[in-house]
């Protein structure tokens, strides 16, 4: 029979190169059965993960999977870093793997670098 444990799935692509000033949605894929768990986002700061309290979030329900979304409207340079979502369900805490955002500041990039440029010039990601 199908397990009804809450699962925080992973996305194959766990790194995102994005441009400051653009909108962006960070998705936390969640599987649950009857009761939707309480899910939160946090940002990694060294070994601790700082809870993001006052950020816009939403749920998107799909057939096989649900997504708890952290909205960046717009992306800011200091959004650069690693994020993790956590689910509270029946007093159990489940943590996801981390997802990393590499933010390019528009002030230092006259135009959006291509994917190839990102790969060949990783310093662009941190400028």
């Amino acid at each position: 029979k199908e397990s009804c444990d809450v699962q925080l799935y992973i996305k194959r692509q766990s790194e995102h190169s994005i441009l400051a000033g653009d909108p962006f949605e960070l998705e936390c894929p969640v599987k649950y059965c009857a009761n939707r768990p309480h899910v939160t986002w946090c940002k990694l700061n060294g070994t601790t993960c700082v809870k993001l309290e006052d950020r816009q979030t939403s749920w998107k329900e799909e057939k096989n999977i649900s997504f708890f979304i952290l909205h960046f409207e717009p992306v800011l340079p200091n959004d650069n870093g690693s994020y993790r979502c956590s689910a509270n369900f029946q007093s159990n805490l489940i943590e996801s793997h981390s997802t990393t955002l590499y933010v390019t500041d528009v002030k230092s990039a006259s135009e959006r670098p291509s994917k190839d440029e990102m790969a060949s010039r990783p310093w662009l990601l941190y400028s």
Epitope: Y9, I10, R12, E15, N64
Partner: antibody
Framework: QITLKESGPTLVKPTQTLTLTCTFS??????????VGWIRQPPGKALEWLAL???????RYSPSLKSRLTITKDTSKNQVVLTMANMDPVDTATYYC????????????????????WGQGTTVTVSS | EIVLTQSPGTLSLSPGERATLSCRAS???????LAWYQQKPGQAPRLLIY???SRATGIPDRFSGSGSGTDFTLTISRLEPEDFAVYYC??????????FGQGTRLEIK
Amino acid sequence: QITLKESGPTLVKPTQTLTLTCTFSGFSLSTSGVGVGWIRQPPGKALEWLALIYWDDDKRYSPSLKSRLTITKDTSKNQVVLTMANMDPVDTATYYCAHIRITEVRGVIISYYGMDVWGQGTTVTVSS
Amino acid sequence: EIVLTQSPGTLSLSPGERATLSCRASQSVSSTYLAWYQQKPGQAPRLLIYGASSRATGIPDRFSGSGSGTDFTLTISRLEPEDFAVYYCQQYGSSPPITFGQGTRLEIK
């Protein structure tokens, strides 16, 4: 029936580059959900994952070895090639390739079926 | 990076006994991504369990997996002589996608 077989040199000198080939049959590396991984095992030690290539040419590397590794695939030849630069005696190990299968929905991995078939392994000694 | 710690390092039992092998993750792992392997001397590893509890093709039902979060268990209900080997747990993640435990050696008492 899925089979994989590793081939490459048995002896490599320090600082040289190792090139290993995984030749497989029974599946296509252009089929969605399929991957091939490389794993090594030094004598008497535990398994260590090295690299992974997916059907869509997405590649993943062990963070500690990323700068030395390159994985490529040739779908028409049913081969995956791993190169490892700047070999050192500590890289002496048996190197395995393995078939991996996942189910993905909108980029989300909803099932991982493990490394379900492995090659027999090839032993590589690094020595001058 | 998620670290998998297996215990005990060595388990000495007799044929017919029950074996319980533990795998503890440094951070919670979805059971979807947890697998177990058996390796005999001079052979490649063999997949036993995937998804924490699903038996791979051809694996006898004396092998079972369980657990969630950070604690996972491989149980062999009645040990057969051919079950004495090294067992590894493995998780599939995002960065890095694959990590193995250090192994548990199951030896004949």
